[in-house]
């Protein structure tokens, strides 16, 4: 058993049929010695008396808010949560496996630039009685500071019969140099509590590996005389690291109709303009990627050919 | 310590092309190592990230773009002195700081070159003959060093009398390649910045 936060405790349980469970001793936070009784949740049934209460925690029915009273007055609370371990593996029931970039990916993180700011998100099908707490650091043995905000519900989607909820959090490394060469990864730890179930999820990464620039901005078309060719120009996204001559991007320019199966024109360039062939009912799209370290491509920025 | 926006002579900054080749060569070599040593811990997640130049050179700090010198987190106090001549200095107006940056890059390359050559000598003794260093990568390191053209004492190639542990050598190769790729990215960014200045 360990303390998650004040008056909230996590009991780690090996979860299998007829498991013996874990013996837990609760102590009432009071100077009083006599006349103390214990109850669980909203029940008025007295579980025991005395300053300490010993319980055998085996299942979710044994978890919950234990309260010690004296003469009708509440003295203190202890909330017990369960953390299940099945076949030596901690449970991951609360969050959905996003399976990208690999199986058992529960947290996904992206950064728009090298400033040390990044966003992580996760998915769940659970809609109520759900709380998240996020901590982060650079390295684990001698951790350097990363400050994370509160996790918020950022999107709701319908997937078949289920509703899916996306939560996200923004974090900022306390003293980040955009030009630095990372040797210690960022560690992100998410505590998830659903009703009386506790789970924790972690992700470890270098900012350089989670870079995904914003799409190029200000796409403009200029038809070339006596030609089917069009000059398309654009600018670096505002959120990209500066100077751009140091943090350079490379671009992919594509002309395509509405269907992915349609024919297309595609060209890669390090410049902020390119010449392509425009077709009726097609659109020109441009995306960006770090020129020197191939992490993710940005989303497409598009304009219609016409 | 930073790179002032110097005004090199018009035309291609002499080292930009070589640095692009360097990044390409080390990326290819790393990819080859990951594929060949698939049953060894050779991915970014599996290895320890070590920097053999730590406390010996200060390329990131010495080559910091002027725009980032206002960022407190970028200003590291490490002091290192370097020789200040070199043919990549495309203009007489080039500052002392730029010379410091380029000589730091030269020292990096020299250290990695020694490490890679020592390692290759060990890998050539491996009866499995599983992996060797790409000669092209070694040649590209050499070309960039020649383009930088700094005079400095030659570092003797390390020779080891004990029987090499090939497993350890291959893991060390992965560590070295990952670190060198990151440094090659920095070098490419620096050359691109200098070329644009």
């Amino acid at each position: 058993i360990w303390e998650l936060k004040k008056d909230v405790y996590v009991v780690e349980l090996d979860w299998y049929p007829d498991a013996p469970g874990e013996m837990v001793v609760l102590t009432c936070d009071t100077p009083e010695e006599d006349g103390i009784t214990w109850t669980l949740d909203q029940s008025s049934e007295v579980l025991g008396s005395g300053k300490t209460l010993t319980i055998q925690v085996k299942e979710f029915g044994d978890a919950g808010q234990y309260t010690c009273h004296k003469g009708g007055e509440v003295l203190s609370h202890s909330l017990l949560l369960l953390h299940k371990k099945e076949d030596g593996i901690w449970s991951t029931d609360i969050l959905k496996d996003q399976k990208e970039p690999k199986n058992k990916t529960f947290l996904r993180c992206e950064a728009k630039n090298y400033s040390g700011r990044f966003t992580c998100w996760w998915l769940t099908t659970i809609s109520t009685d759900l709380t998240f707490s996020v901590k982060s650091s650079r390295g684990s043995s001698d951790p350097q500071g990363v400050t994370c905000g509160a996790a918020t519900l950022s999107a709701e989607r319908v997937r078949g019969d289920n509703k899916e909820y996306e939560y996200s959090v923004e974090c900022q490394e306390d003293s980040a140099c955009p030009a630095a060469e990372e040797s210690l990864p960022i560690e992100v730890m998410v505590d998830a509590v659903h009703k009386l179930k506790y789970e924790n999820y972690t992700s470890s990464f270098f900012i350089r590996d989670i870079i995904k620039p914003d799409p190029p901005k200000n796409l403009q078309l200029k038809p070339l005389k006596n030609s089917r060719q069009v000059e398309v120009s654009w600018e670096y996204p505002d959120t990209w690291s500066t100077p751009h001559s140091y943090f350079s991007l490379t671009f992919c320019v594509q002309v395509q109709g509405k269907s992915k199966r349609e024919k297309k024109d595609r060209v890669f360039t390090d410049k902020t303009s390119a010449t392509v062939i425009c077709r009726k009912n097609a659109s020109i799209s441009v995306r960006a990627q770090d020129r020197y370290y191939s992490s993710s491509w940005s989303e497409w920025a598009s304009v219609p050919c016409s | 310590r930073n790179l002032p926006v110097a005004t090199p002579d018009p035309g291609m900054f002499p080292c930009l092309h070589h640095s692009q080749n360097l990044l390409r060569a080390v990326s290819n070599m790393l990819q080859k190592a990951r594929q060949t040593l698939e049953f060894y811990p050779c991915t970014s997640e599996e290895i320890d990230h070590e920097d053999i130049t730590k406390d010996k050179t200060s390329t990131v700090e010495a080559c910091l773009p002027l725009e980032l010198t206002k960022n407190e987190s970028c200003l590291n106090s490490r002091e290192t002195s370097f020789i200040t001549n070199g043919s990549c200095l495309a203009s007489r107006k080039t500052s002392f700081m730029m010379a410091l940056c380029l000589s730091s890059i030269y020292e990096d390359l020299k250290m990695y070159q020694v490490e890679f050559k020592t390692m290759n000598a060990k890998l050539l003794m491996d009866p499995k003959r599983q992996i060797f260093l790409d000669q092209n990568m070694l040649a590209v390191i050499d070309e960039l060093m020649q383009a930088l053209n700094f005079n400095s004492e030659t570092v003797p190639q390390k020779s080891s009398l004990e029987e090499p542990d090939f497993y350890k050598t291959k893991i060390k190769l992965c560590i070295l390649l990952h670190a060198f790729r990151i440094r090659a990215v920095t070098i490419d960014r620096v050359m691109s910045y200098l070329n644009a200045s």
Epitope: Q229, K263, R266, V267, F268, D270, T275, R279, K280 | -
Partner: antibody, heavy 118, light 107 residues
């Protein structure tokens, strides 16, 4: 299976014209760009131009501009390349090629030898 | 027009040995570079597109690398059926242009 089948060899007099055909099978004809590339005996490859069979748009290499015409007939899934004012240096194997991507070629015809000789 | 220069023009190789062909562009073409194989009397066959992207059905011994102006086609271990002429082609701008070709011959 996508295939491009070209017309047979031709012998032409200098100053005349030649029209080579390229019939496509497998896949929808208008879903692909169609190019013509030539190869002189023992020489390399030389791109001549492309057509979008969907709308008849064409683009030609400056070297052949004014002498080459590429057309397409959607009803028969056939593309044509006509080269006029032939000279002896136009003796070559003419290849058609296609792709959903405009700028490179993933399926080629077998080639048509055009000999220009007086 | 962008001029593509291949080297060497002839490459004698022992079967089972690796082979590398170089292609240089007269100006930077990013990764807009494709490789073809051509055997006598046959049409070319696409091997690699956009400098390093492999084609399904093409043996994994063929790989491409490079960007900017310098590109390489590598055959890790030459098989008897790989003796042919190889061409690079740029697609950075029209007109599309090819290298002169490199003939890989049996040593």
């Amino acid at each position: 299976q996508v295939q491009l089948v070209q017309s047979g060899a031709e012998v032409k007099k200098p100053g005349s014209s030649v029209k080579v055909s390229c019939k496509a099978s497998g896949g929808t004809f208008s879903d692909y760009y169609l190019h013509w590339v030539r190869q002189a005996p023992g020489q390399g490859l030389e791109w001549m131009g492309w057509i979008d069979p969907e709308n008849g748009d064409t683009e030609y290499a400056p070297k052949f501009q004014g002498r080459v015409t590429i057309t397409a007939d959607e009803s028969t899934s056939t593309a044509y390349m006509e080269l006029s004012s032939l000279r002896s240096e136009d003796t070559a194997v003419y290849l058609c090629a296609r792709n959903k991507e405009l700028r490179y070629f993933d399926v080629w015809g077998q080639g048509t030898l055009v000999t220009v000789s007086s | 027009d962008i001029v593509m220069t291949q080297s060497p023009l002839s490459l004698p190789v022992t079967p089972g040995e690796p082979a590398s062909i170089s292609c240089r562009a007269s100006q930077s073409i990013s990764i807009n570079l494709h490789w073809y194989q051509q055997k006598p009397g046959q049409a070319p066959r696409l091997l690699i597109y956009f400098a390093s992207q492999s084609i399904s059905g093409v043996p994994s011994r063929f790989s491409g690398s490079g960007s900017g102006t310098d590109f390489t086609l590598t055959i890790s271990s030459l098989q008897p059926e790989d003796f042919a002429t190889y061409y690079c082609q740029q697609s950075n701008s029209f007109p599309l242009t090819f290298g002169q070709g490199t003939k890989v011959e049996i040593k």
